[in-house]
């Protein structure tokens, strides 16, 4: 296994607007210029892909237009933001990093960030 160490925070609390941000940092053994980052969500022992992007070092991550993710890169760090989260989206979000170019190829998978999402309380009706 072409394992590479990936670090990410253990816990993140989403904002009241359903936005969660965390940093995914990888210890690159090579001199990669093009990197693929995938965010996976693990819940109830099922793993699903949330979003993915391949980026050139020093450039912004370009996710698909309809993606709920955005991100920026700086060196071996990727700053990921996931938006549109609701309480039901609470779960473990795993950062997967692949060094795609040039060879050698390396793969790293973080331990996951537990993102807690609390739906905001509806505003009470006002008599004023």
């Amino acid at each position: 296994c072409k394992a590479m160490h990936v670090a990410q925070p253990a816990v993140v609390l989403a904002s009241s607007r359903g936005i969660a941000s965390f940093v995914c940092e990888y210890a690159s053994p090579g001199k990669a210029t093009e990197v693929r980052v995938t965010v996976l969500r693990q819940a109830d022992s099922q793993v699903t892909e949330v979003c993915a992007a391949t980026y050139m070092m020093g450039n912004e991550l370009t996710f698909l237009d309809d993606s709920i993710c955005t991100g920026t890169s700086s060196g071996n760090q990727v700053n990921l933001t996931i938006q549109g989260l609701r309480a039901m989206d609470t779960g473990l979000y795993i950062c997967k990093v692949e060094l795609m170019y040039p060879p050698p190829y390396y793969l790293g998978i973080g331990n996951g960030t537990q993102i807690y999402v609390i739906d905001p309380e509806p505003c009470p009706d006002s008599d004023f």
Partner: antibody, heavy 117, light 111 residues
Framework: EVQLVESGGGLVQPGGSLRLSCAAS????????IHWVRQAPGKGLEWIGI????????KYAQKFQGRVTISRDNSKNTLYLQLNSLRAEDTAVYYC??????????WGQGTLVTVSS | DIQLTQSPSSLSASVGDRVTITCRAS??????????LHWYQQKPGKAPKLLIY???SLESGVPSRFSGSGSGTDFTLTISSLQPEDFATYYC?????????FGQGTKVEIK
Amino acid sequence: EVQLVESGGGLVQPGGSLRLSCAASGFTFSDYAIHWVRQAPGKGLEWIGIISPSGGSTKYAQKFQGRVTISRDNSKNTLYLQLNSLRAEDTAVYYCARLGYGYFDVWGQGTLVTVSS
Amino acid sequence: DIQLTQSPSSLSASVGDRVTITCRASQSVDFYGISFLHWYQQKPGKAPKLLIYDASSLESGVPSRFSGSGSGTDFTLTISSLQPEDFATYYCVQALQLPLTFGQGTKVEIK
């Protein structure tokens, strides 16, 4: 199904040029580096070059330097090989191959190029 | 560039024989504990097929009679009991650095 399909082969005159295409399907083309490899009749596999996932970087084997150009159009899921100043020794089957997890995990079926007058 | 030298260039064997092919690199193809050396099988008129990746990992769907070993500069592909469908040409390739390079191939023929 993940596949690569080459096209554009055929008979070419010595001194001429060829442009081969490699159409990808079944995977996110823009995530992968792709290579061209060729095989002359009865000979071994020979690496021609590679293009990075974005298309921003290419690298060629020394013997093809200055005579070959690899390009890609990620919006069309297509890879190209342009080879100029063709000679009889360029007669070969040309393959495109995906560099998946550090190895060639998907190959095209190959397209035969014959250089002859 | 890393040169790969395979031996023998051809061999004749019978069904049931144990066959060993070696691949020697001009410099180490190891990096951070991984050997970036892979083995392919090719039959006439067909594209190469991956057998072994990272020197010793068996590709999914490949029979267990195929195995790979080695590290650094010296690698071996072994077919424990040759089957009729194994008569083909075998190539090693290094994917540590560009340019990628192939061995010259080993043709396994029927004795």
